[in-house]
Structures are given as C-alpha cells and as structure tokens.
Amino acid sequence: SAPFSFLSNVKYNFMRIIKYEFILNDALNQSIIRANDQYLTAAALHNLDEAVKFDMGAYKSSKDDAKITVILRISKTQLYVTAQDEDQPVLLKEMPEIPKTITGSETNLLFFWETHGTKNYFTSVAHPNLFIATKQDYWVCLAGGPPSITDFQILENQA
C-alpha cells in the first residue's frame, strides 16, 4: 500500500449520489450479498433479490484528481463499505449521514472508480494499489489482484 501520510492532506468533498440501487456481479457472475451482518461475500444467486443493492456517491478531491472518487452505501440503509488492510474483509460501517467532507484516516470509506468497457474496478483511496475483490470461500476484501477477482459488472434498475 501507499504510505498513508501521502494521502492524509487531501480533502474530499461530497458532491451527489450518482447511482442508486445497483447490483455488483464479479467476473464469475457471482453477486455480492450481505452475510452475517457486517460482512459481504459473493454467491451465484437464483434470486437476485438476495443481492445487495448499492448507492454510489461522488466526491471531489481538493487535489483536483482526474479519478472519480466514490463512496458505496447499501441502499435504504446508513451502512457504508469500509476498507481495512490487504486480504482483510471490507466492513459495513454505520453512519448517521453521508459524510460531507472526508480526509485522513476516513479515506478508508472512499474508492477510485475506474471503468474499462463493462468492467468496473474500485481501488481503495487509503490503499491505492488494492481493489475491492471477491475471493473463493471468503468475504469481499481488499486485494492486489489474482487469485482474487477485482472486476465487477454493474447491474442497474433491477426490479
């Protein structure tokens, strides 16, 4: 990971919610589900109602970074995806409202969102060389790449 001090002076200001109620599927077509309260995992679902629906909020960097910086929230909740360390599960953090400004250690709530065709990648702002990833028989975690799966398809407007 990048040294944390490199990031600590950058300030991120909330702009707006840019996507509502979408599902994330990994490259194996597994959907992200909420398991055991504060964890996420991936599973092949017969019923997409069991998949987590996410909202995505956009932030603007004081560094005027060209990257799109986002926060991920479970729709209709106050639970936000929070990065830990490499190979550690991402957690769901409860907050009363979406943070208006994020800086320092709070950047574990933020991800750089990159798209390449239909593939979507979410890199941790706190750990810029680690991605949100799925891993066989494990939780959704932060990983640098294979064998973890780091590319996702966004499914929008699921009934």
Epitope: I33, A35, V52, I74, S75, K76
Partner: antibody, heavy 122, light 107 residues
Framework: EVQLVQSGAEVKKPGVSVKVSCKAS????????MHWVRQAPGQGLEWMGW????????TYADDFQGRVTFTLDTSTSTAYMELSSLRSEDTAVYFC???????????????WGQGTTVTVSS | DIQMTQSPSSLSASVGDRVTITCRAS??????LNWYQQKPGKTPKLLIY???RLHSGVPSRFSGSGSGTDYTFTISSLQPEDIATYFC?????????FGQGTKLEIK
C-alpha cells in the same frame, strides 16, 4: 438443499438448564446468521436473539439477557442454544432459523428447523 | 425497539373469500416487513419478504403491500390449505420483532 435439524424433545426440572442443538446442511454455515425463536403453547413467535456464525458474537433479546447463551461448533455446522434457570413459563417449542438479507437491507428468516419441545415441570 | 401490532388476532372466512390482515410498526420500517405462515403443529414458513416479494414456491393468491408503518397481507381467494396462523415481522433493525399473529379459520 438447505436443512436445519434440531435435537429431540426435552423434559427438565425448574432451575436447571437445557441445551438445544441445530445442525445445518446444504450451505456454507458461516455465511448466514442463526436465530433462535420460541413459541409457548398457543402463543406467538418470540425472537430470542441471534449468533454471528463467523465471529461467534451473539445478540440477545432483553427478556433473555443473562439467561441464554448461543454457541457454535463450526466443524460440524451446528449452533446451540442453552437456557438456564428454567421455569415453567419456559415451556415452549424452540426453533432455530437461518437469517438472510434481501437487497442487503431487509432481514428475514427463510429456513427454519423443525422445532424442539422443551417442557419444564417439577 | 420497534413494536409490531397485528390485527385481527383471529378471523373466520369462507373458501373463495378475500382475506386481509394488517400489521402496524411503531416506527417507519422502510418496507422491511415479512410475513410467515404457520400451520398447526408445523414450523413457520416465510411467505413474503420486503413487503410484497413472494418467497419461492408461494402461490400467487398471497400478496403484500404497504409502506412506512402500515402493511397489509392479502389472500385473494381463500383455500382450505390456507388454514394457519400468520405472523408479520420487521426486518429493519434489531431486535427483529414479530406481530402477535392472526389465526385464520374456515367458516
């Protein structure tokens, strides 16, 4: 096929404890929380609490706090509920139930054990 | 804690009737409302989740609606096999309270 199989009926004297087991099969045990719900004769469903099958942490309903303990044996995919200081009002059917989140926000119990009858009588 | 108030506590209806049960939460539960069916001597069974979504294998005569604090469960045409007690349950936040139940009988 998801199955929750509970231990058999128990008859206990007041003041002692009872331990009910719930063996899960057909899914990854540590992915979904396990809940315990009881039903006194002719009464409704009473949520007792749940156990996080990954961390082992439990949350108990206020009415059972201090008297109930949930435990796990992940090697056999089994959850346990122990209720102590039994009294006649604890005579009930005890169910285990697997929890699931729909959309990541709405919680339901979509698979249930067959129930274990516990009778407390002197 | 969120309290769930279910009504009526019992009702009697004829085969083919439309049957309605209501459930009121003590605060907004954002559609996180489930309905269960329990036949005599059997285990409870999830029928409807998230207010209106039918669990797999549940007949389409069962339906649910509502929002905020007020929710309704309907059987469009009562069948003899629907004799059971029905419970609502909020799935918004711990503790996951159930309603008191509605015992449904055939006239």
């Amino acid at each position: 096929e998801v199955q929750l199989v509970q231990s058999g009926a128990e008859v206990k004297k007041p003041g002692v404890s009872v331990k009910v087991s719930c063996k899960a099969s057909g899914y990854t045990f540590t992915t979904y929380g396990m809940h315990w719900v009881r039903q006194a004769p002719g009464q409704g469903l009473e949520w007792m609490g749940w156990i996080n099958t990954y961390t082992g942490e439990s949350t108990y309903a206020d009415d059972f706090q201090g008297r109930v303990t949930f435990t796990l044996d992940t090697s056999t995919s089994t959850a346990y509920m122990e209720l102590s200081s039994l009294r006649s009002e604890d005579t009930a059917v005890y169910f285990c139930a697997r929890g699931i989140y729909y959309y990541g926000s709405s919680y339901a119990m979509n698979y249930w054990g067959q129930g274990t009858t516990v009778t407390v009588s002197s | 804690d969120i309290q769930m108030t279910q009504s009526p506590s019992s009702l009697s209806a004829s085969v083919g009737d439309r049957v309605t049960i209501t459930c009121r939460a003590s605060q907004d539960i954002s559609n996180c409302l489930n309905w269960y069916q329990q036949k005599p001597g059997k285990t409870p069974k999830l029928l409807i989740y998230y207010t209106s979504r039918l669990h797999s294998g549940v007949p389409s005569r069962f339906s649910g609606s509502g929002s905020g604090t007020d929710y309704t469960f309907t059987i469009s045409s009562l069948q003899p096999e629907d004799i059971a007690t029905y419970f609502c349950q909020q799935g918004k936040t711990l503790p996951y309270a159930f309603g008191q139940g509605t015992k449904l009988e055939i006239k």
